[in-house]
């Protein structure tokens, strides 16, 4: 018989990670803290008017490798950084917008030859 307070070894389960969330808080978040089995992230991107907007929150383990890979998106300036090393680690992430390329100045149908 097992003594009370004694059990067999735990099965491997993900340990919840708490992240700061801003502009990206899920319905279960409390006090701008969300919970995930994956990564914390901070992202900066331009909105439609060209103003930089910083977003932070939680990414689930599934698909987060792809989301955390900062692959360039045509005609969209954005940068994302992810972390898992401690709770609220994304407080210390400060991604910066990639530099403007010449073609990013092209507005609508006007083309420079």
């Amino acid at each position: 018989k097992k003594e009370d307070g004694e059990s067999t070894a735990p099965t491997a389960r993900p340990k919840v990670l708490r992240c700061k969330c801003h502009h990206h808080c899920p319905e279960d978040s409390v006090n701008n803290i969300c919970s995930t089995d994956g990564y914390c992230f901070t992202m900066i991107e331009e909105d439609d008017s060209g103003t930089p907007v910083v977003t932070s929150g939680c990414l689930g383990l599934e698909g987060s490798d792809f989301q955390c890979r900062d692959t360039p998106i045509p005609h969209q300036r954005r940068s994302i950084e992810c972390c898992t090393e401690r709770n609220e680690c994304n407080k210390d992430l400060h991604p910066t917008l990639p530099p403007l390329k010449d073609r990013d100045f092209v507005d609508g149908p006007i083309h420079h030859k």
Epitope: E6, P10, K15, V16, S29, D37, G60, R86, N87, E88
Partner: antibody
Framework: QVQLQQPGAELVKPGASVKLSCKAS????????MHWVKQRPGQGLEWIGD????????NYNQKFKGKATLTVDTTSSTAYMQLSSLTSEDSAVYYC??????????WGQGTTLTVSS | DIVMTQSPSSLAMSVGQKVTMSCKSS????????????LAWYQQKPGQSPKLLVY???TRESGVPDRFIGSGSGTDFTLTISSVQAEDLADYFC?????????FGAGTKLELK
């Protein structure tokens, strides 16, 4: 196997403080959150708070902020809960328990705290 | 805080009977991101610490007899013991693990006739 060892009982005078311990073994101490739960005789269970031993990050139930302080000593794989300004309302069984995702996989046997002069 | 309400507060059953107990939450425990219900059930025998029976509403903990069945979604949950045994005499608590502060129901006491 997982063990969470807690002293059986503590007797403390009103107004004093007490530091309850929970010694963990049988698993990697930093891989699970450590929680503390209060149970008064014949009553339900109340979550006090939790601590992540890997970075000492804590969450507290608002009701126990200022009453309970959670700490860990990773070298000895021991979690502690200090309770301050004790009154008879603090007399209860206090359990430590571990979790991966906020449900309690394993529980200690509990420490019965009696506050009496 | 999420309020958990259990009913009945006690029930007396004979060995072999089917037992059903209810747990209701003041808000939905269903996470849209993964379609899981964040509800756990525990058994506490007299003089012992609680023991995990079910998590995510219906996932039985390893080593728990299959007569214990968790079901439900959203705000309404049920623990069923398909054929109650003498060793099932205990208090049963539900707990939401949807967000902090984690909260428990007041419990259902199972007594044997």
């Amino acid at each position: 196997q997982v063990q969470l060892q807690q002293p059986g009982a503590e007797l403390v005078k009103p107004g004093a403080s007490v530091k309850l311990s929970c010694k963990a073994s049988g698993y990697t101490f930093t891989s699970y959150w450590m929680h503390w739960v209060k149970q008064r005789p014949g009553q339900g269970l109340e979550w006090i708070g939790d601590i992540d031993p890997s970075d000492r990050y804590t969450n507290y139930n608002q009701k126990f902020k200022g009453k309970a302080t959670l700490t860990v000593d990773t070298t000895s794989s021991t979690a502690y809960m200090q309770l301050s300004s004790l009154t008879s309302e603090d007399s209860a069984v206090y359990y430590c328990a571990i979790s991966g995702w906020d449900y309690f996989d394993y529980w200690g046997q509990g420490t019965t705290l009696t506050v009496s002069s | 805080d999420i309020v958990m309400t259990q009913s009945p507060s006690s029930l007396a059953m004979s060995v072999g009977q089917k037992v059903t107990m209810s747990c209701k939450s003041s808000q939905s425990l269903l996470k849209s991101s993964n379609q899981k219900n964040y509800l756990a059930w525990y058994q506490q025998k007299p003089g012992q610490s609680p023991k995990l029976l079910v998590y995510f509403a219906s996932t039985r903990e390893s080593g728990v007899p299959d007569r214990f069945i968790g079901s439900g979604s959203g705000t309404d949950f049920t623990l069923t013991i398909s054929s109650v045994q003498a060793e099932d005499l205990a208090d049963y608590f539900c707990q939401q693990h949807y967000n902090i502060p984690l909260t428990f129901g007041a419990g259902t006491k199972l007594e044997l006739k």
